[in-house]
Amino acid sequence: MAVTACQGLGFVVSLIGIAGIIAATCMDQWSTQDLYNNPVTAVFNYQGLWRSCVRESSGFTECRGYFTLLGLPAMLQAVRALMIVGIVLGAIGLLVSIFALKCIRIGSMEDSAKANMTLTSGIMFIVSGLCAIAGVSVFANMLVTNFWMSTANMYTGMGGMVQTVQTRYTFGAALFVGWVAGGLTLIGGVMMCIACRGLAPEETNYKAVSYHASGHSVAYKPGGFKASTGFGSNTKNKKIYDGGARTEDEVQSYPSKHDYV
């Protein structure tokens, strides 16, 4: 029950996170005009990854797309790439995790397959979240650098009475949406990975190998501790000796050519 809850919660948190990453990527307010020097501006500038906009006090808003690809700063291109990679990975992760949900039955899918899918989607969510956080952080760093550069150059070129006052930009709402969304996706991914531990079968698929000693039969189990996934936690006390030469989870063990020496 706890596993299903963890998996379900991880899925929902990741879903919200990815929706937030998509929203942040599409938002125009990645950077907004700094109003510290002029809080009563008539023209408010703000910029996104895809276009820059102006909101006038007249109520009119106009946006202008970045129609060039080669003319854009490499950092902006990198941020775009990181956000898109984050969205793609997140979308694939969501698709995989839907089929991995314990509450959804698809044919005769085994728990091990669901565990693997849960782990895969979890890793995808983690990488997706990291991509979003990295993208937003790179953009934020770019803003901070440009902010101080434009502050230093604010009144340069004051030839005669003409002043060129540079428009300074500060953090926009999209940055905070991106950071939160990336964090949620990351948390959702971690929850999926945790849920994977509980979904994985308690035992490995190794059959018990029986050694017949002269007085009594001894079953040596090489899979006493899980070594396959690394997520297996052996909290239960396992039987090492079992007269019936049967694995603990099996109702019946069929002999094979490896069973007896």
Epitope: Q33, N38, V40, T41, A42, V43, F44, N45, Y46, Q47, S52, C53, V54, E56, S57, S58, G59, F60, E62, C63, R64, V162, Q163, T164, V165, T167
Partner: antibody, heavy 118, light 113 residues
Framework: EVQLLESGGGLVQPGGSLRLSCAAS????????MSWVRQAPGKGLEWVAT????????YYADSVKGRFTISRDNSKNTLYLQMNSLRAEDTAVYYC???????????WGQGTLVTVSS | DIVMTQSPDSLAVSLGERVTMNCKSS????????????LSWYQQKPGQPPKLLFY???TRESGVPDRFSGSGSGTDFTLTISSVQAEDVAVYYC?????????FGQGTKLEIK
């Protein structure tokens, strides 16, 4: 047809008060930012005040700040300018204007004359 | 505050002549957001309220004859009348629309010789 009709002007003594009104018609008044601009006799144009669409923000020229108040009543399609502590230099024709894209003033009223004199 | 300076203060030209008037701002009126210059031009005929000619420095208002043209960017702007007509006699004002307080130039008076 867009129309802006100012009223409320007249002769007032220095230190007195006056309230100008601008009745708007022919357009959705509540969807536009509105301004007052004045012109002293034989002089150039001077922007006085602006009130944005919702009325939540108002902007004033330094020369009238603290004395004049711009307001609007969207239900009555009317723009107001409350003028207190009037001075001789406030004597002018006051125009009511509508702001459009580019912050340009595309429609102007015929103006109302305010004379501040003792 | 942004200071708007127009030149010349007045000019007298013959009918059909080409006329150019200038407007200089103390700060750039170019918006980085949409790459538009926030400057308007107005025409005021005697005894009438001003009439909008151009916004965004060069976008002609509907109904304005195409003999009028607006140009310029940043801090230097120009209003040109390619062939002056008798009805063009007026005072022409430029206005800063970029930041409050909105400021007008002192005006350029156009007369016919």
């Amino acid at each position: 047809e867009v129309q802006l009709l100012e009223s409320g002007g007249g002769l007032v003594q220095p230190g007195g008060s006056l309230r100008l009104s601008c009745a708007a018609s022919g357009f959705t008044f509540s969807s536009y930012t509105m301004s007052w601009v004045r012109q002293a006799p034989g002089k150039g144009l001077e922007w006085v005040a602006t009130i944005i669409i919702g009325g939540s923000y108002t902007y004033y020229a330094d020369s009238v700040k603290g004395r004049f108040t711009i307001s609007r009543d969207n239900s009555k399609n009317t723009l107001y300018l409350q003028m207190n502590s009037l001075r001789a230099e406030d004597t002018a024709v006051y125009y009511c204007t509508r702001l459009v894209k580019g912050q340009a003033m595309d429609y102007w009223g015929q103006g109302t004359l305010v004379t501040v004199s003792s | 505050d942004i200071v708007m300076t127009q030149s010349p203060d007045s000019l007298a030209v013959s009918l059909g002549e080409r006329v150019t008037m200038n407007c200089k701002s103390s700060q750039s009126l170019l918006s980085s957001g949409n790459q538009k210059n926030y400057l308007s031009w107005y025409q005021q005929k005697p005894g009438q309220p001003p009439k909008l000619l151009f916004y965004w420095a060069s976008t002609r208002e509907s109904g304005v004859p195409d003999r009028f043209s607006g140009s310029g960017s940043g801090t230097d702007f120009t209003l040109t009348i390619s062939s002056v007509q008798a009805e063009d006699v007026a005072v022409y004002y430029c206005q800063n629309d970029y930041s409050y307080p909105f400021t007008f130039g002192q005006g350029t008076k156009l007369e016919i010789k």
